[in-house]
Amino acid sequence: LRRCLISTDMDHIEDSFQEIKRAIQAKDTFPNVTILSTLETLQIIKPLDVCCVTKNLLAFYVDRVFKDHQEPNPKILRKISSIANSFLYMQKTLRQCQEQRQCHCRQEATNVTRVIHDNYDQLEVRSAAVKSLGELDIFLAWIAKNHEVTSSAAAHHHHHHSGS
């Protein structure tokens, strides 16, 4: 299972998010509603389900949020694009685990992501995308807690080998 823990440069992603967090959250027209259901929902996830939930949440952001969001500010767009790109590479790394049948999705894990998608569907698409971007810190904190995250200084010691 350890091979399915993504090792990525979270400093870069978190720095990018911190630079745009205030601007994104200021656009949130439903501050009392949550999509990621606060950190508590993610806290109850068992170690066995971490790979699956990570995979599903990456897909949620890559396939829904980053596609639905319309960003007029070029500087913010650049930061969001950078985060999205990092997520895409994380997603591709986890796909290796799926191919090796090391990222099994149990019902509990599937339920967590279903709730998040349901929450997203309750809002108009643009509002849902903005809110989900504003809640990225919840997902990033969870990744930091559950994966072998690397700082920029140490990251060069780590690499993945791609299957043939």
Epitope: D63, S82, A84, Y89, K92, R95, S152, H158, S162, G163
Partner: antibody, heavy 122, light 107 residues
């Protein structure tokens, strides 16, 4: 000017190592993943792997596992690809290529170096 | 590894012709796919990414379609500068792989 400039041609003997450099200019080096692709004479393209210049993280195609090392020096915006235990079938043009950063996210090598010919011959 | 099979391996066409190149993947790769053009002695050039998105600066006569296992590159009206070799690339699964190439020659 946005470009990737690679080091010059190399001639190596079988068993030796080669280190090809790729210097980026005109854009933020740490903001884009860099890939290495090679092309044997008269043949098609072959993906070797990538490096994240920001973190130094890498992912290598298994075919090159144990023989390839991708590194970078952010202070001079340069990436390196070192291939060891060279064989005659490693004779190829080696390219570095930058990945696009777009929304929604996708892969695409939008900027390429001019290529470095590595000849392995006894 | 996922294999990409391009067809035809070569074709002859005239300026103004509509040209279609296909690429078939050995398994479902969603839309994690691109097309590149390469001229002799030059580095490849990105034409299409994400199966159908046209790269900035690429003429609109180039278009890409398909998802899953079957993909198509279409040049609506072949121009003199389009005579080159075209490669497809899948980035769905590691190792990322290219097709063997399709050479477009002048008839």
């Amino acid at each position: 000017q946005v470009q990737l400039v690679q080091s010059g041609a190399e001639v190596k003997k079988p068993g030796a190592s080669v280190k090809v450099s790729c210097k980026a200019s005109g854009y933020t080096f740490t903001g884009y993943y860099l890939h290495w692709v090679r092309q044997a004479p008269g043949q098609g393209l072959e993906w070797m792997g990538w490096i994240n210049p920001n973190s130094g993280g890498t992912n290598y195609a298994q075919k090159f596992q144990g023989r390839v090392t991708m590194t970078r020096d952010t202070s001079i915006s340069t990436a390196y690809m070192e291939l060891s235990r060279l064989r005659s079938d490693d004779t190829a043009v080696y390219y570095c290529a930058r990945d696009i950063v777009v929304l929604p996210p996708a892969i695409g090598f939008d900027l390429w170096g001019q290529g470095t010919l590595v000849t392995v011959s006894s | 590894a996922i294999q990409l099979t391009q067809s035809p391996s070569s074709l002859s066409a005239s300026v103004g012709d509509r040209v279609t190149i296909t690429c078939r993947a050995s398994q479902d790769i969603r839309s994690d796919f691109g097309w590149y053009q390469q001229k002799p002695g030059k580095a490849p050039k990105l034409l299409i990414y994400a199966a159908s998105s046209l790269q900035s600066g690429v003429p609109s006569r180039f278009s890409g379609s398909g998802s899953g296992t079957d993909f198509t590159l279409t040049i609506s009206s072949l121009q003199p500068e389009d005579f080159a070799t075209y490669y497809c690339l899948q980035d769905y699964n590691y190792p990322w792989t290219f097709g063997q190439g399709t050479k477009v020659e002048i008839k």
